[in-house]
Amino acid sequence: ILGGREAEAHARPYMASVQVNGEHLCGGVLVAEQWVLSAAHCLEDAADGKVQVLLGAHSLSQPEPSKRLYDVLRAVPHPDSRPDTIDHDLLLLQLSEKATLGPAVRPLPWQRVDRDVEPGTLCDVAGWGIVSHAGRRPDRLQHVLLPVLDRATCNRRTHHDGAITQRMMCAESNRRDSCKGDSGGPLVCGGVLEGVVTSGSRVCGNRKKPGIYTRVASYAAWIDSVLA
């Protein structure tokens, strides 16, 4: 997260760290007792490493009573996701067992009504992604509030030049932005999950390159079918 601040500890009990061989790789969001939603491209970076999900964490390194690392029983990338595009960049991870719920671990309601978030709406994005252009990684969860950007502006040639489909949404990126390591994490508007940080190799913090988020409402049928 660029230009953000440390989150209040455990105030986002849905927040997950998708880890490979014990290292944070991507963000994720607990959407059901045994399921974490993340970004499909995160699996590509995992190679053949052991994928696990950390729940109930604020600090990645320090012991915390609510922290627990779960093995992944099944990884389900969206069937239409491709390495060379950010289309359909969603991944569902089934935990080896149901998460132990509590004040620091709780699923987040996700948007099912397929309607665009009003431009200008302030939404919260959180993650353990880099906090500087130099690539500094935080130990504790960071967050930032970002205004939603209308799709027409996001589709301008100097922004994303027509690449933003109706299944994506954008948020402003003027110094405050999601960045590398935040992919797969939640964009939360009004207490509801609206978007998932896409995992392209986008420049961060440049206002002409807005953050791109996969709209979960556009994938309600797929999410429901996997969770069923």
Partner: antibody
Framework: EVQLQQSRPELVKPGASVKIFCKAS????????MNWMRQRHGETLEWIGD????????SYNQKFKDKATLTVDKSSSTASMELRSLTSDDSAVYYC?????????WGQGTLVTVSA | DVLMTQTPLSLPVSLGEQASISCRSS???????????LEWYLQKPGQSPNLLIY???NRFSGVPDRFSGSGSGTDFTLKISRVEAEDLGVYYC?????????FGGGTKLEIK
């Protein structure tokens, strides 16, 4: 299939105004800016301005700010451009073009002829 | 405004020959985001312009690979490796990095 259908040719008198239209189909109108260009006979293209269909917010080439007014009607997915105080210099083909990717999609053009 | 100067004004070629069109901008057209928004359009007689190349060297979908774009800073080139009859028309370079966006004066590709 993305289509931009422009209104028919116009013959107008000097000093008059004219409004030309660009109806979009095959995509969600509010997802892309609409741009307008002018091309006088045998000459290059000139950018007049653009408009965000979400909020109707236009921006203009300084050269055309007193000549053109851009508007949109979201309900009919139509962009329009009014040209005022017309002179023979304004005789040209006027194009609308969707922005994104680049100017990949253009209307067929509307010929405006200013003549007494 | 950024002036886009194209040369030559007219380019007579034989079918199957290579054609090369130059475009020079009056200032650098590298955008503040690091990208260069230099595009090439072909306008056939009586038609609207068609996008060929965007961001200097990227072919738009459906554009044959005999078209290629190159250049940087202020100097750009469009090459057609083997001219076909359907390639005839007026070619325009365009910059979208600075407001207002501007087109070059055009190069008419015609049969020798």
């Amino acid at each position: 299939e993305v289509q931009l259908q422009q209104s028919r040719p116009e013959l107008v008198k000097p000093g008059a105004s004219v409004k030309i239209f660009c109806k979009a189909s095959g995509y969600t109108f509010t997802d892309y800016y609409m741009n307008w260009m002018r091309q006088r006979h045998g000459e290059t293209l000139e950018w007049i301005g653009d408009i965000n269909p979400n909020n109707g917010d236009p921006s203009y080439n300084q050269k055309f700010k007193d000549k053109a007014t851009l508007t949109v009607d979201k309900s009919s997915s139509t962009a329009s451009m009014e040209l005022r105080s017309l002179t023979s210099d304004d005789s040209a083909v006027y194009y609308c073009a969707r922005e994104g990717p680049s100017f990949a999609y253009w209307g067929q053009g509307t010929l405006v002829t200013v003549s007494a | 405004d950024v002036l886009m100067t194209q040369t030559p004004l007219s380019l007579p070629v034989s079918l199957g020959e290579q054609a090369s069109i130059s475009c020079r901008s009056s200032q650098t057209i590298v955008h503040s985001n690091g990208d260069t928004y230099l595009e090439w359009y072909l306008q056939k007689p009586g038609q609207s312009p068609n996008l060929l190349i965007y961001k200097v060297s990227n072919r738009f979908s459906g554009v044959p690979d005999r078209f290629s774009g190159s250049g940087s800073g202020t100097d750009f080139t469009l090459k057609i490796s083997r001219v076909e009859a359907e390639d005839l028309g007026v070619y325009y370079c365009f910059q979208g990095s600075h407001v207002p966006p501007t087109f070059g004066g055009g190069t008419k590709l015609e049969i020798k």
